[in-house]
């Protein structure tokens, strides 16, 4: 089938990085500078994307692949192929319809993007809060309140000794 197709359509032999030049008897010509073809059998090459302004070049254009852009520092890509640059917030904030806003009490965000998430509810696991949460950090859960009752040891007993040469299961 491939052989039949190539007999019918000489352009199918043109590899990525070239185009089928109708002006030159359908010879495979290299893509001109600042253009590319990512698949074979193309009749034209696509113009390379230029990362200008707030967009910076993350990957240069080649004859077989388009350039890839990212955003100026303090901003991150949004949309297909980085069509927009969205601002980073501080840790402890989230991006809302009114811009970067502090996380509400009881929520946190340890990233510069994304949303504020509720603190872990330690009591659901029968544990107590060891370290309080902040806008930037989740709570740290500790032993269950029963484990901390008077007389109860909070020291972890030593692990049983292993025979030399045996790795843990």
């Amino acid at each position: 089938f491939e052989r039949t197709r190539s007999l019918q359509d000489p352009c199918s032999n043109c590899p990525a990085g070239t185009f089928c030049d109708n002006n030159r008897n359908q010879i495979c010509s290299p893509c001109p500078p600042n253009s590319f073809s990512s698949a074979g059998g193309q009749r034209t090459c696509d113009i390379c994307r230029q990362c200008k302004g707030v967009f910076r070049t993350r990957k240069e254009c080649s004859s077989t692949s388009n350039a890839e852009c990212d955003c100026t520092p303090g901003f991150h890509c949004l949309g297909a192929g980085c069509s927009m640059c969205e601002q980073d917030c501080k840790q402890g904030q989230e991006l809302t319809k009114k811009g970067c806003k502090d996380c509400c009490f009881g929520t946190f965000n340890d990233q510069k993007r994304g949303i504020c998430r509720p603190w872990t509810n330690c009591s659901l696991d029968g544990k107590s809060v060891l370290v309080n949460g902040t806008k930037e950090r989740d709570v740290v859960c500790g032993p269950s309140p029963a484990d901390l009752s008077p007389g109860a040891s909070s020291v972890t007993p030593p692990a049983p000794a292993r025979e030399p040469g045996h790795s843990p299961q």
Partner: nanobody
């Protein structure tokens, strides 16, 4: 609803300075990206400078080292300090505010202030 009012434009000679102000009212814009755009006659609107809520700044190549964008969240105001002005800086300067991104489709725009650099 945010309203933006620019001021500080005028006629100056090459090499002189101007400071543009953009006062926001109607809501606080401390969490917004604030931007200065300009449009010269017969040309496309061009992003000059931007400042994120965290304080990251962006400048177009032609103004780097000459222009400085800053914000005063307490006054709900953003500034553009323009030094060593050149005739090619002549344009109408627009302030814009967007809660999220740098885009020509910013949520809020001012009416613009004319800057003319001529000897």
């Amino acid at each position: 609803e945010v309203q933006l009012v620019e001021s500080g434009g005028g006629l100056v000679q090459p090499g002189e300075s101007l400071r543009l102000s953009c006062a926001a009212s109607g809501d606080t814009v401390s969490g917004y990206v604030m931007l200065w755009w300009r449009q010269a006659p017969g040309k496309e609107r061009e992003l000059v400078a931007a400042i994120s809520s965290v304080g990251y700044t962006y400048y177009t190549d032609s103004v780097k080292g000459r222009f400085t964008i800053s914000r005063d969240n307490a006054k709900n105001t953003v500034y553009l300090q323009m030094n060593s002005l050149k005739p090619e800086d002549t344009a109408v300067y627009y302030c814009a505010a967007d809660p999220a991104s740098i885009s020509t489709r910013s949520a809020y725009w001012g009416q613009g202030t004319q800057v003319t650099v001529s000897s």
